[in-house]
C-alpha cells in the first residue's frame, strides 16, 4: 500500500497553535543538519556532484530513533542536529509528523514523491507500538522479508521503491550482505514546475567549465527577465531565488573565482532565511543548465561522519524494534532525484510578460561549480542540497 | 562522444506497422530532446516530431499525428518512432535529431524504410 | 504552418567566390533559424543556429544573418568540401518547418 496514503491524510493537528507550527521548531535543526551533512560530504571529494534530502534523511532516521534506545537513540537525534536539553522528543516527532503532512498534501502542485521503507527479517517479532507510531506519525510501514534469499529480498526492497516512485527510481539497492537482517530505503524524487518558465526554444548548448582544465557541453536555459537575484558580499556569490508552483523555491548560489569553499564554509540557517524574506527582483540575463541530477548513499558511511554509529553497530539497541533478538541496522541507502528543466504550466510563458528596465542588465551564467539549496516554502525546510561540479556527470 | 545510433534499413510490407529505433550515447539523454525527421528522395526534409525523454513530453507535426507515436526508453537511452498502417508513401529516411531546445544539433545516420509487399 | 522558401534551389559557383543562400519565413520567426549541410547519400549536419550563431568545428568561412522574415547564409570562400544541399529551418512555432534545399555545386 502506498506509504503516504490514507495516513497522510488522517493525521489531525487541531489542537496545535497554527500560527506557530511545531515543525518550525525543528526547521533550523534540519537546516544545520543539512549543511553539516553537505560539508561532510563536501571535504570527502571536491570533484563530485553532491545531492541529498536533508528532510528525506532526517525524517528516516528520527522514525528510526522511535525503535532505539539509550545511547543508539541519543546518537541519531544529535546527529540530526536535536538537543534534547531545548526541545522535547515528542515535539521533534510531532514536527516531523507535520512536516510530512504539509509536503505530501493531495492538492499541492509540487511534484514531490518520498518515502521510508524499513525491512526486517523474517521471524522477528516487532513490536506493535514501532509500528502504530512509523505509521501515525511518519506515514511509513515497516516489511518483512527473508534475507536468506538476498535476490528475492533485493527485489522486494527494489519493487517497492519503484512502485512508490511510479517507475522513476529503479535498482536502488544494488547488493544486499547475506547477513542483512535490518535494511532501511529512503527516497525522494521531484521535477517541478517553475512560477515563471524557461521557453525551450531558447535553451542552447554552452561550455560549462568543471575547472581550470575541463569544459563540457551542456544545454543552457536562458532568460532575459526579472529575478530575484543579487550579488552578495558576504557569501561572495550571486544568490537567485527561483519559486517553483506549489511553495518550493530554489535558491542557486555561484560563486565568485575561488571562492566555492568559502560560500560553503558560510552557509547557515539565518542568512538562508534573510534571503528567503527577500522579494526584491531586478532585471538579469540567466544562464542556467539543465539538470538531471541524482544522489545515491550509503548512510552509514555517511552519517557514521555526523557521530550516528551505533545503530549499525552490534552493540545497537534497537529494542524498540524488537524485543526478540540483538538487531543492528545493516544498510541504509538514500537516493534522491532531480530535474531541472525549462517547464512551468502550460502557456505560462505568456502570462509574464515583463518591462525590463533600458540599463543593461549583468548576465549571470551558471557555467561553472555552483551549490543549490531547494526550500519548501510552508516549513522553510531543506528539502534538497547540492553542488553541481559537473552537470554531465552520471 | 555523442552518438546517435539507427539500423541502417528496414523491409516492411504495407499496411503492417514498424518501430524504429535511436540508442544515445556520449551525453546525458534526459536532458536533451529527441526529434524525428522524415526525407523522402528528391523531396526535402520534414519534421515528424519531438520527444522529451525526462517526461515524455510530445509535440507532433499534425500532419503525423495519426501516423507517428514517439516513445523513449531511459534504462537503455533510447528512442522510438512507431509508424503505423505503412503505405509506400512512408518509404523513406528517418533521422533521429537530438536538440538542447529548439535547434537540431545533432544528426543520426538514418533508417531507410521500404515498404513493399 | 509557417512556410519557408529558400532561394535559389540551386547555385553554381566557383572556388574561392563568396556565395549566399537566403531563406523567407511566411512570418516573423524571431532569428529561431538553423542551417544544415547534406552531402549525397549523409546524413544533415548542423552548421548555424539562432540564425547567427556557429556551431563548434563549423568552419569560420560560414555565417549566417537575418531577422525577422528574411535570413541569409554566406560561404565567404567556397571550398571544394562545401558541395551539397543546404537547408534552412524555422524553430520559432510548431509544426518545425524546413526550406526546400539549395543544391550547391563547383564550376
Known amino acids: 500500500e502506498d506509504p503516504q496514503g490514507d495516513a497522510a491524510q488522517k493525521t489531525d493537528t487541531s489542537h496545535h497553535d497554527q500560527d506557530h507550527p511545531t515543525f518550525n521548531k525543528i526547521t533550523p535543526n534540519l537546516a544545520e543538519f543539512a549543511f553539516s551533512l553537505y560539508r561532510q560530504l563536501a571535504h570527502q571529494s571536491n570533484s563530485t556532484n553532491i545531492f541529498f534530502s536533508p528532510v528525506s534523511i532526517a525524517t528516516a532516521f528520527a522514525m528510526l530513533s522511535l525503535g532505539t534506545k539509550a545511547d543508539t537513540h541519543d546518537e541519531i537525534l544529535e546527529g540530526l542536529n536535536f538537543n534534547l536539553t531545548e526541545i522535547p522528543e515528542a515535539q521533534i516527532h510531532e514536527g516531523f509528523q507535520e512536516l510530512l503532512r504539509t509536503l505530501n498534501q493531495p492538492d499541492s502542485q509540487l511534484q514531490l514523491t518520498t518515502g521510508n521503507g524499513l525491512f526486517l527479517s523474517e521471524g522477528l517479532k516487532l513490536v506493535d507500538k514501532f509500528l502504530e507510531d512509523v505509521k501515525k506519525l511518519y506515514h511509513s510501514e515497516a516489511f518483512t522479508v527473508n534475507f536468506g534469499d538476498t535476490e528475492e529480498a533485493k527485489k522486494q526492497i527494489n519493487d517497492y521503491v519503484e512502485k512508490g516512485t511510479q517507475g522513476k527510481i529503479v535498482d536502488l539497492v544494488k547488493e544486499l550482505d547475506r547477513d542483512t537482517v535490518f535494511a532501511l530505503v529512503n527516497y525522494i524524487f521531484f521535477k517541478g514546475k517553475w512560477e515563471r518558465p524557461f521557453e525551450v526554444k531558447d535553451t542552447e548548448e554552452e561550455d560549462f567549465h568543471v575547472d581550470q582544465v575541463t569544459t563540457v557541453k551542456v544545454p543552457m536555459m536562458k532568460r532575459l527577465g526579472m529575478f530575484n537575484i543579487q550579488h552578495c558580499k558576504k557569501l561572495s556569490s550571486w544568490v537567485l531565488l527561483m519559486k517553483y508552483l506549489g511553495n518550493a523555491t530554489a535558491i542557486f548560489f555561484l560563486p565568485d573565482e575561488g571562492k566555492l569553499q568559502h560560500l560553503e564554509n558560510e552557509l547557515t540557517h539565518d542568512i538562508i532565511t534573510k534571503f528567503l524574506e527577500n522579494e526584491d527582483r531586478r532585471s538579469a540575463s540567466l544562464h542556467l543548465p539543465k539538470l538531471s541530477i541524482t544522489g545515491t548513499y550509503d548512510l552509514k558511511s555517511v552519517l557514521g561522519q555526523l557521530g550516528i554509529t551505533k545503530v549499525f553497530s552490534n552493540g545497537a539497541d534497537l529494542s524498540g524494534v524488537t524485543e526478540e533478538a540483538p538487531l543492528k541496522l545493516s544498510k541504509a541507502v538514500h537516493k534522491a532525484v532531480l530535474t531541472i528543466d525549462e517547464k512551468g504550466t502550460e502557456a505560462a510563458g505568456a502570462m509574464f510578460l515583463e518591462a525590463i528596465p533600458m540599463s543593461i542588465p549583468p548576465e549571470v551564467k551558471f557555467n561553472k561549480p555552483f551549490v543549490f539549496l531547494m526550500i519548501e516554502q510552508n516549513t522553510k525546510s531543506p528539502l534538497f542540497m547540492g553542488k553541481v561540479v559537473n552537470p554531465t556527470q552520471k | 562522444q555523442v552518438q546517435l545510433q539507427q539500423p541502417g534499413a528496414e523491409l516492411v510490407k504495407p499496411g503492417a506497422p514498424v518501430k524504429l529505433s535511436c540508442k544515445a550515447s556520449?551525453?546525458?539523454?534526459?536532458?536533451?530532446?529527441m526529434n524525428w525527421v522524415k526525407q523522402r528522395p528528391g523531396r526535402g526534409l520534414e519534421w515528424i516530431g519531438k520527444i522529451d525523454p525526462s517526461d515524455s513530453e510530445t509535440h507532433y507535426n499534425q500532419k503525423f499525428k495519426d501516423k507517428a507515436t514517439l516513445t523513449v526508453d531511459k534504462s537503455s537511452s533510447t528512442a522510438f518512432i512507431q509508424l503505423s498502417s505503412l503505405t509506400s508513401e512512408d518509404s523513406a529516411v528517418y533521422y533521429c535529431v537530438r536538440s538542447p531546445g529548439g535547434y537540431p544539433d545533432w544528426w543520426g545516420q538514418g533508417t531507410t524504410l521500404t515498404v513493399s509487399s | 504552418d509557417i512556410t519557408m522558401t529558400q532561394s535559389p534551389s540551386s547555385i553554381y559557383a566557383s572556388l574561392g567566390k563568396r556565395v549566399t543562400i537566403t531563406c523567407k519565413a511566411s512570418?516573423?520567426?524571431?532569428?529561431?533559424l538553423s542551417w544544415f549541410q547534406q552531402k549525397p547519400g549523409k546524413s544533415p549536419k548542423t552548421l548555424i543556429y539562432r540564425a547567427n550563431r556557429l556551431v563548434d568545428g563549423v568552419p569560420s568561412r560560414f555565417s549566417g544573418s537575418g531577422s525577422g522574415q528574411d535570413y541569409s547564409l554566406t560561404i565567404s570562400s567556397l571550398e571544394y568540401e562545401d558541395m551539397g544541399i543546404y537547408y534552412c529551418?524555422?524553430?520559432?512555432?510548431?509544426?518545425?518547418?524546413f526550406g526546400g534545399g539549395t543544391k550547391l555545386e563547383i564550376k
Open positions: 556520449g551525453y546525458i539523454f534526459t536532458s536533451y530532446w
Open positions: 529551418l524555422q524553430y520559432d512555432e510548431f509544426p518545425y518547418t
Open positions: 512570418q516573423d520567426i524571431n532569428s529561431y
